[in-house]
C-alpha cells in the first residue's frame, strides 16, 4: 500500500514503528483503550462486565466507573447493602437473603415487608376439598365439607371404600404461587 510512518497512520495517539517485515511498512502500538491496525477502534472495556450485581458500566476513557443499583455499593458494586445484617423482621419473622435483595419470611398470621401487618392465614386456602378455614388463637381450624375428614379435610369418608380423590388441577406444583 506504500503507507509509512511518515503518513501518520496511527490514530488516537498510537505510536508508529517501521515494520521489520517488508510486507508491513509500519506497526501501530496503541495506547490503552484503543485497538485495531491503526488504533482506530475504541476497546469496549465494559464488555468484560466488571460491574457486579447488575451495575451499569460507564467507560469514561481514562477510567471505568460502575453505577450501582439500589442496595449495592463499591467500585464494582460488590457490596450488598441489603443483606440481613441489621435488618429486623417483626413478630418473629426471619430475614432471607437472595438475589441481592432481602425479604422477611413471616411467621403465621403476619405479612408485609417487615412482618408488621396482620395477615389472614386462611387466605392461603389451607383446607382441602372445599373445607372452610377459621383462624383460632391456637392455630387454624378447618370445618370440612360433608364427606371429608382430617385436620385439613384431606381424607374422604367413603363407606363404600371408593378410592378416587378429586384430581389436582393441572400444572399446580407444591411451591407454585397461589391461584
Amino acid at each position: 500500500s506504500g503507507v509509512t510512518c511518515a503518513d501518520g497512520p496511527c490514530f488516537n495517539g498510537g505510536l508508529c514503528v517501521g515494520g521489520a517485515d517488508p510486507d508491513s511498512a509500519y506497526i501501530c502500538h496503541c495506547p490503552p483503550g484503543f485497538q485495531g491496525s491503526n488504533c482506530e477502534k475504541r476497546v469496549d472495556r465494559c464488555s468484560l462486565q466488571p460491574c457486579r450485581n447488575g451495575g451499569l458500566c460507564l467507560d469514561l476513557g481514562h477510567a471505568l466507573r460502575c453505577r450501582c443499583r439500589a442496595g449495592f455499593a463499591g467500585p464494582r458494586c460488590e457490596h450488598d447493602l441489603d443483606d440481613c445484617a441489621g435488618r429486623a423482621c417483626a413478630n418473629g419473622g426471619t430475614c432471607v437473603e437472595g438475589g441481592g435483595a432481602h425479604r422477611c419470611s413471616c411467621a403465621l398470621g403476619f405479612g408485609g415487608r417487615d412482618c408488621r401487618e396482620r395477615a389472614d392465614p386462611c387466605a392461603a386456602r389451607p383446607c382441602a376439598h372445599g373445607g372452610r378455614c377459621y383462624a383460632h388463637f391456637s392455630g387454624l381450624v378447618c370445618a370440612c365439607a360433608p364427606g371429608y375428614m382430617g385436620a385439613r379435610c384431606e381424607f374422604p369418608v367413603h363407606p363404600d371404600g371408593a378410592s378416587a380423590l378429586p384430581a389436582a388441577p393441572p400444572g399446580l406444583r407444591p411451591g407454585d404461587p397461589q391461584r
Epitope: 413471616c106 403465621l108 392461603a124 386456602r125 389451607p126 385439613r152 379435610c153 384431606e154 399446580l172 407454585d176
Partner: antibody, heavy 124, light 113 residues
Amino acid sequence: QEQLVESGGGLVQPGGSLKLSCKVSGFDFSNYGVSWVRQAPGKGLEWIGYIDPAFGRTYYASWVNGRFTISSHNAQNTLYLQLNSLTAADTATYFCVRVALVVAGVAYYGMDVWGPGTLVTVSS
Amino acid sequence: DVVMTQTPASVEAAVGGTVTINCQASQNIYSYLSWYQQKPGQPPKLLIYRTSTLASGVPSRFKGSGSGTQFTLTISDLECADAATYYCQSYYYSSGSSYGAFAFGGGTEVVVK
C-alpha cells in the same frame, strides 16, 4: 428460596438423648408442614413424624412410642426433634423435610424440599 | 399402620430401555402416593406426587399411575443418570388414632447398563 438445614447430630451413648434442630426459611406454614425422616446406613427411608404448625398439630409413626418429640419454636422458624432412650438401632441420618400439605385448597402430602441431613451415631 | 410393599428390590436395564416399579399399600390410600429418587450421599428428591403429577423440573420420561392400593412408577428412555434408588411414599388415615400418617416403601435399586 425454600430451605431446611439440620444440625445437632453426633455421637451419643446408648440410653442417651439428643436434640436435633432444623432451621427453615422461605415458605409459609399455612400450606406446609415439616416431617422428620431417618435413614440407617445402607437402609431405606423411615418416617418419624411431622408437625403442622399452622394447625398446632404433631403426628408420629406408631413405632416411635413416645421416645421422640417434635416441637417448634421462635415463631415457627426452627423445629426440633428430641431423641430419648437411644439405642444402636437409632443410628441413622436424620432428615428434616418440607411437606406440601394443602396448597390453594388442593391436598398433596408430598415431601418436596429435603435438608442435607445430620448423622446420629449411637455407640458406646 | 399402612405397610408399603415395593417390588422389585432391584432391577437392571439398558440405556434407552424401560423400568417399571410397583408399590402396593396394605389399605386404601386414595391418590396420596409420591415417588422419590435417591442417589448415594444425597437426600431424596421428589419425582411424582398425588400418584401421577410430576414435580417441577422432572422429565416426562417418569410416569406414575394407579389408585387405591396399587401404584406404578414407569421410567422410559432410561439414561445413565437414572441409576438410583427409588422409594414410594404414602399418606393415609390412621383410623385407630384418627390422624394422618406417612409410610415409605422399602426401595428399588435401578441399575442402568
